[in-house]
């Protein structure tokens, strides 16, 4: 089928990084500067994304792949492919529509992004509090209260785990 298609459609022979130029008898022309084609058989090249303002270039555009952006310091990516940059807050804060606000008592945020979340209620999972929570850290739950009866071995609190987070894709 691919061979048949290439006989019928000369454009299918144009590799990534080129386009099938109708103005030049359907020969494969390289993508012009600041444009790319990531697949073969394209009739046009796509304009490269430009990382301007609060965006900065993470990966330069090439003839076969678009540029990738991330955010300048003090901001983080939101959306697929870092379509937006959002202001960072401090740990122990969350970004509201009115700006960065401290987490209320009983909630925490150990990231520079995201929301203030309620401390885990250890008792609901049949456990006890080993380390109290703060604005920046969730509580650390330990064994159930019954396991801490006299004679039970002591438990060393684990280091606070880092909250979920990910870098821009």
């Amino acid at each position: 089928f691919e061979r048949t298609r290439s006989l019928q459609d000369p454009c299918s022979n144009c590799p990534a990084g080129t386009f099938c130029d109708n103005n030049r008898n359907q020969i494969c022309s390289p993508c012009p500067p600041n444009s790319f084609s990531s697949a073969g058989g394209q009739r046009t090249c796509d304009i490269c994304r430009q990382c301007k303002g609060v965006f900065r270039t993470r990966k330069e555009c090439s003839s076969t792949s678009n540029a990738e952006c991330d955010c300048t310091p003090g901001f983080h990516c939101l959306g697929a492919g870092c379509s937006m940059c959002e202001q960072d807050c401090k740990q122990g804060q969350e970004l509201t529509k009115k700006g960065c606000k401290d987490c209320c008592f009983g909630t925490f945020n150990d990231q520079k992004r995201g929301i203030c979340r309620p401390w885990t209620n250890c008792s609901l999972d049949g456990k006890s509090v080993l380390v109290n929570g703060t604005k920046e850290r969730d509580v650390v739950c330990g064994p159930s209260p019954a396991d801490l009866s006299p004679g039970a071995s002591s438990v060393t609190p684990p280091a606070p785990a880092r909250e979920p987070g990910h870098s821009p894709q």
Partner: antibody, heavy 120, light 106 residues
């Protein structure tokens, strides 16, 4: 590709417990909170709770506190939701859903759902 | 606890614009997300943070949020848009969903 795959349908007697699993693949599993949401037949969506796959911290909807337990197996990239003391009104499709990273807890990827039927 | 109110149903002719509302006390101060759910399928996020579209969601889907009402707008409605739509917010310590709106394409 990124996906959440849930365990199969269950039929339970009133008073019993059910444990539904949700296996994540194609992304950094510990990097995103996992939520559980249920939907009774012909009804809307009802949030049950979340787990932080990294540290294991949980938060449950008040309605389910004391009956639901959400756990995880980090090595298997799997979250579990156990609901106890089942009653007929717990008959529903149970979904796991990944929380994205926009402000305000959006659920950007969902499992296919697990039908739990509670019947005597 | 916080409540979100949606109309149970909205009907629209193909090619026209559908608007689905989500009411809540001072909802404009919150981030609103919208999900589409077709029969027998899991929900799909179509709008997040009031008005942003995940990749793969057509530009026909848009959102707004101010005062006490958030709105999901679907322009140039197609038969394939027929589904249930849910709004959702985060309030204090819980995820809250609206009751859902059934969109019928006439």
């Amino acid at each position: 590709q990124m996906q959440l795959v849930q365990s199969g349908a269950e039929v339970k007697k009133p008073g019993a417990s059910v444990k539904v699993s949700c296996k994540a693949s194609g992304y950094n599993w510990t990097g995103y909170y996992m939520h559980w949401v249920r939907q009774a037949p012909g009804q809307g969506l009802e949030w049950m709770g979340w787990i932080n796959p990294m540290a294991g911290g949980t938060n449950y909807a008040q309605k389910f506190q004391g009956r639901v337990t959400i756990t995880r197996d980090t090595s298997a990239s799997t979250a579990y939701m156990e609901l106890s003391s089942l009653r007929s009104e717990d008959t529903a499709v149970y979904y796991c859903a990944r929380e994205g990273w926009a402000r305000g807890v959006e659920l950007d990827m969902w499992g296919q759902g697990t039908l739990v039927t509670v019947s005597s | 606890s916080y409540e979100l109110t949606q109309p149970p149903s909205v009907s629209v002719a193909p090619g026209k614009t559908a608007r689905i509302t989500c009411g809540g006390n001072n909802i404009g101060s919150k981030s609103v997300h919208w999900y589409q759910q077709k029969p027998g399928q899991a929900p799909v996020l179509v709008i997040y943070y009031d008005s942003d579209r995940p990749s793969g969601i057509p530009e026909r889907f848009s959102g707004s949020n101010s005062g006490n009402t958030a709105t999901l707008t679907i322009s140039r409605v197609e038969a394939g848009d027929e589904a249930d739509y849910y709004c959702q917010v985060w309030d204090s310590s819980s995820v809250v969903f609206g009751g859902g709106t059934q969109l019928t394409v006439l």
